[in-house]
């Protein structure tokens, strides 16, 4: 049975040209995290493997930096970066937990962070 929950930075906004940290945290489970994948739609942004470290997809290498921790830093933001981002926690023995973050990149200088909130939804991948 999967008992864990993923807490994320939730709905966030940032200014065009700036940077933002995407962060997820898995709690309430003793499952071992073997890998965390960061994704945007059908694009794989990065993989953080517990043994092997970080792999940033070549398409994103100039604008994505690993960390802090298991998080991901997006740099030189454009309006096209607006959208859903997912952290996929591959764990043993639980399976897969998914967290969702919505990022809005704003033209103006009025950009605020949304509140952190918990995502109760998770699914188990066999």
């Amino acid at each position: 049975m999967m008992t864990g929950t993923i807490e994320t930075t939730g709905n966030i906004s940032a200014e065009k040209g700036g940077s933002i940290i995407l962060q997820c945290h898995l709690s309430s489970t003793t499952a071992q995290v073997t890998q965390v994948n960061w994704e945007q739609q059908d694009q794989l942004l990065a993989i953080c493997n517990a043994d092997l470290g970080w792999h940033i997809s070549p398409s994103f290498k100039d604008r994505v930096a690993p960390g802090p921790g298991l998080g991901l830093t997006l740099q030189s933001l454009t309006v096209n970066d607006t959208g859903e981002y997912f952290c996929i926690y591959h764990t043993y023995p639980d399976g897969t937990y998914t967290g969702r973050i919505f990022l809005e990149v704003l033209e103006s200088s009025v950009a605020e962070h949304g509140a952190r909130f918990q995502i109760p939804h998770h699914h188990h991948h066999h």
Epitope: T34, N37, D42, Q43, N49, A50, D51, G53, H55, S57
Partner: antibody
């Protein structure tokens, strides 16, 4: 240039332990990930597992109970042990390097492979 | 485990013609796919990583495309030295898995 060379017996008896070594030259095994991959005759390539730059190991769950990958940093080599072998373990065994940072799980350097037959 | 299914099993193409190899993943692997070339009696060689990026020294007649579950390796103009078996591999999650291979021959 990175070079990998497998060595070990070509014939192993059923129920015994298969032991192979991979000697690495041109690169230190304290960087990157060092893998064993096999190819049974007429079948898919099968990833067996790796030992990381730090010495951590990960094994394919289908073989986990029988596999041990270890390393000897002083000799710059790593080894595979597969216990309780059967005819299904007959395959060409490759050692390989994986530069995870640059290429993810794509294997960029392979040994030439060594054929292991399990037979009495 | 994620199953990678290649088609066709074999392919005969005239010299200078286009060869297209398909690979289907049993679940969404985004762009975490590599392609390898294995010539008779040799070990596999990395050709494409991250679905569409050519590895160092790979001729530009080789290209990869796709994301999600469907991927393609294309040889735009087949040369005699391209005769080989080609394998796809996913590295979206462990255990990393390979396709069954596609044999490319000259017609």
């Amino acid at each position: 240039e990175v070079q990998l060379q497998e060595s070990g017996p070509g014939l192993v008896k059923p129920s015994e332990t298969l032991s192979l070594t991979c000697a690495v030259s041109g690169y230190s095994i304290t960087s990157d990930s060092w893998n064993w991959i096999r190819q049974p005759p007429g079948k898919k390539l099968e990833w067996i597992g790796y030992i990381s730059y730090s010495g951590n190991t990960y094994y394919n769950p289908s073989l986990k109970s029988r596999v041990t990958i270890s390393r000897d940093t002083s000799k710059n080599q790593f080894s595979l042990k597969l216990s309780s072998v059967t005819a299904a373990d007959t395959a060409v065994y490759y050692c390989a390097r994986l530069d995870f940072s640059n290429y993810g799980g794509a294997v960029d350097y392979w040994g030439q492979g060594t054929t292991v037959t399990v037979s009495s | 485990d994620i199953v990678m299914t290649q088609s066709p099993d074999s392919l005969a193409v005239s010299l200078g013609e286009r060869a297209t190899i398909n690979c289907k993943a049993s679940q969404n692997v985004r762009t975490a796919v590599a392609w390898y070339q294995q010539k008779p009696g040799q070990s596999p060689k990395l050709m494409i990583y991250s679905a569409s990026y050519r590895y160092t020294g790979v001729p530009d007649r080789f290209s990869g495309s796709g994301s999600g579950t469907d991927f393609t390796l294309t040889i735009s103009s087949l040369q005699a030295e391209d005769v080989a078996v080609y394998y796809c591999q996913q590295y979206y999650t462990t255990p990393w898995t390979f396709g069954g291979g596609t044999k490319v021959e000259i017609k």
